[in-house]
């Protein structure tokens, strides 16, 4: 054999009941003492340190704290140190070191030592991870190490958890033994925090000691505060606010078009949006997320405003006879009212719709103008103006005429047009052709769609000529004789001599 | 140099008490084991025991337990023997010897006995 | 116990010879742990305390002459006094202490 000793690391009983602490040494065989001797010692193994002596096989004495208190059940002779402490109290806790003592010199205190623990708790062993929905196993854990009093393990606050069971005394790796009872459950969520006791109690003693475990169990999120969907006036301040219930607390993202816009490990997250603009409005999205699961919640902001300045699409120039078509849009919520004007009088209007189709089939002159296309809704009104223009072929109105004033003929020829034409005056019986161009001749004036050319023939009043009025533009030519107003009803009269 | 230096001699009557002392000079005595050696006349030597002179442990021979008691008083360097109920056979000369001993350590381990004190005879007669 | 035994119990040589003694334990004085035998030799001269002679079996003390020797291991020791001188004269033990301390029973030397 060599020196050593076995004995538990550590070994815990219950302040107040007792512990047997398993011991065998061993030494060289060619010691052969006649009478093995042992002393046991209290938290140093150095005799030098005067640690406390525990129990001492040569003679009685022992320390104060120990008298009576300490008694050997091994047998020295069979290198067996088995060692009981009873009545223990709290500063009994701590390292005891076997020695023995062969005689001669042979006296040796072995390294390895028991560390005593003194409890006044049961031992609740929950797994590192308890999860809802998945059936877990907590045990109620004490020490049995006291031959003269043994514990009985009960469950507290185990309502609705099932029914324990006793597995009764277990032996440990290194020679202690424990009273172990278990109870198997299947945990949800609203068991988290749960508190689950379990008492141990010795017969007939009034010793009794209780010990409480706080359930932590894991749960995924599920989002239970959301706003339902948010309408808010632009320039407004907006906030949104996402509350999941999760264990541990999730990962919340606040997120927009697969975008995150903010994200916190909180149980609450508002997402706040000042000054609001209608980019902003759309469907948000609240992620929540742990270890164990996610879940996730929409929110549809509407963002509220004015119309926008309408916009129009569409022809602008048309040709007399052609169906014109105009697309008139905005933006705007909630969508407006879109009405279009000519001259105050509407032409066509739609109700909540963001745009408005105006057709024209066979469009006349008397289409061509300014037209007002106006978006409304409860947050106001925005127009935009636009033009048609019509093209079509002269008309040379009937209030074109000739007239003679003293010694001068004027004639007069309103065309309506559109492109503007070319104005030319025909005197057919002096075989001369006027063009607008000669401007000692023509005086031409363009109001909106009507040209008015005025020719002036000085001298000519006495025998005023035919005019014929000649209007050209790329869709076609009129021609009219001028009348002359007034050549019935002419006076002469002349006066002196 | 190292000096054991015991009382004198004894002469007690059966049933009285003795205490015989070893006094060490020469090195630090604490740090050496005190033997006890009895040798009757014309027999050979006989280990009573020894005593830690660090922590005041005695540890005595299986035959010398009971009326033996060894016991030290550092301040003076000096151990002691003290035999009670003197009987006849306890007539002998009692030696102390040191011993170096590693007892800074938790165990001990023997060293041989080097210095010896020059004895003190103790003779029980009526 | 461990039990030492000495041969002879007495022993007479010529000065200048050499002296032998014999020492057996009844159980191995090796010890294991260190592989050393736990064994010492003592001379006593009459009146006076025993001498240290030799210790660890053949571990001579400072001081003493190197005519003393001593050889042998586990059970079976000799001390060996390679040529006799005059004040050799004495009782010499042997000496176990590895278990409860023993003496053999000596044996005297003397001068032929």
């Known amino acids: 054999g060599h020196w050593g000793a076995w004995m538990p690391s550590s070994i815990s009983a219950f302040e107040g009941t007792c512990v047997s602490i398993p011991c065998r040494f061993d030494f060289p065989d060619e010691l052969r003492p006649a009478v093995v001797h042992g002393v046991w010692y209290f938290n140093s193994p150095y005799p030098k340190n005067y640690p406390p002596v525990v129990f001492k096989s040569r003679t009685q004495v022992v320390h104060e704290s120990f008298q009576g208190r300490s008694r050997l059940l091994g047998d020295l002779g069979l290198r067996n140190c088995t060692l009981l402490l009873s009545t223990l109290s709290p500063e009994l806790g701590g390292k005891y070191y076997f020695r023995g003592d062969l005689g001669g010199y042979n006296q040796y205190t072995f390294s390895e030592h028991s560390v005593l623990d003194i409890i006044n708790t049961p031992n609740i062993v929950v797994p590192p991870e308890v999860v809802a929905g998945t059936e877990v196993e907590v045990s109620c854990m004490v020490p049995d190490n006291c031959p003269e009093l043994r514990p009985e393990l009960s469950w507290l606050g185990h309502e609705g958890l099932g029914e324990p069971t006793v597995l009764g005394r277990l032996r440990e790796d290194e020679g202690t033994w424990v009273q172990v009872s278990l109870l198997h459950f299947v945990p949800t969520r609203e068991a988290n925090g749960h508190r689950l006791g379990c008492q141990a109690a010795f017969p007939n003693t009034t010793l009794q000691f209780e010990g409480y475990a706080s359930l932590d169990v894991k749960y995924p999120p599920v989002i239970v505060e959301m706003n339902s969907s948010v309408e808010a006036i632009e320039g407004s301040h907006v906030s949104l606010l996402c509350g999941a219930d999760s264990n541990p607390p999730p990962l919340l993202t606040w997120m927009r078009d697969g975008m995150v816009l903010r994200e916190a490990v909180a149980e609450s997250l508002y997402l706040d949006l000042e000054e609001v603009t209608p980019a902003e409005d759309g469907i948000y999205a609240c992620l929540a997320e742990n270890a164990y699961g996610q879940d996730n919640r929409t929110v549809e902001l509407s963002v509220m405003y004015a119309p926008w300045k309408p916009t129009v699409n569409g022809t602008v120039v048309a040709v007399e006879g052609e169906t014109v078509s105009i697309l008139c849009s905005t933006q705007s919520n909630p969508d407006p009212i879109l009405t279009i004007f000519k001259e105050k009088q509407i032409l066509a209007t739609v109700i909540y719709e963001s745009q408005l189709q105006l057709e024209l089939p066979a469009v006349t002159p008397e289409d061509d103008g300014e037209y007002w296309c106006v978006a409304e809704n409860q947050y106001g009104q925005r127009a935009t103006a636009f033009n048609l223009s019509v093209e079509f072929a002269p008309i040379i109105l009937l209030e074109s005429h000739c007239a003679a004033a003293r010694d001068t003929v004027q004639c007069l020829c309103v065309v309506k047009s559109n492109p503007e034409p070319s104005v030319a005056f025909e005197l057919p019986s002096r075989n001369v052709t006027v063009n607008e161009t000669e401007r000692e001749f023509v005086y031409s004036e363009r109001s909106g769609l009507l040209l008015t050319s005025i020719l002036t023939l000085r001298g000519q009043a006495q025998a005023p000529p035919r005019v014929i009025c000649t209007s050209r533009n790329l869709y076609g030519t009129q021609s009219l004789e001028l009348p002359f107003q007034g050549a019935h009803r002419l006076m002469w009269a002349k006066i002196g001599p | 140099q190292v000096q054991l230096v015991q009382s004198g001699s004894e002469l007690k009557k059966p049933g009285a008490s003795v205490k015989v002392s070893c006094k060490a000079s020469?090195?630090?005595?604490?740090?050496?084991?005190m033997n006890w050696v009895r040798q009757a006349p014309g027999q050979g030597l006989e280990w009573m025991g020894w005593i830690n002179t660090y922590t005041g442990e005695p540890t005595y021979a299986d035959d010398f337990t009971g009326r033996f008691v060894f016991s030290l008083d550092t301040s003076v360097s000096t151990a002691y023997l003290q035999i009670s109920s003197l009987k006849a056979e306890d007539t002998a000369t009692y030696f102390c010897?040191?011993?170096?001993?590693?007892?800074?350590?938790?165990?001990?381990?023997?060293?041989?006995?080097?210095?010896w004190g020059q004895g003190t005879l103790v003779t029980v007669s009526s | 116990d461990i039990v030492m035994t000495q041969s002879p119990d007495s022993l007479a040589v010529s000065l200048g010879e050499r002296a032998t003694i014999n020492c057996k334990s009844s159980?191995?004085?090796?010890?294991?742990?260190?592989?050393?035998?736990?064994l010492a030799w003592y001379q006593q001269k009459p009146g006076q305390p025993p001498k240290l002679l030799i210790y660890w079996a053949s571990t001579r003390e400072s001081g003493v002459p190197d005519r003393f020797s001593g050889s042998g291991s586990g059970t079976d020791f000799t001390l060996t006094i390679s040529s006799l001188h005059t004040e050799d004269v004495a009782v010499y033990y042997c000496h176990q202490y590895l278990s409860s301390l023993t003496f053999g029973q000596g044996t005297k030397l003397e001068i032929k």
């Open positions: 010897a040191r011993n170096p001993i590693n007892y800074y350590g938790i165990n001990y381990e023997g060293y041989v006995m080097d210095y």
């Open positions: 159980h191995s004085v090796l010890y294991s742990s260190n592989q050393k035998n736990y």
């Open positions: 020469g090195y630090t005595f604490t740090n050496y084991g």
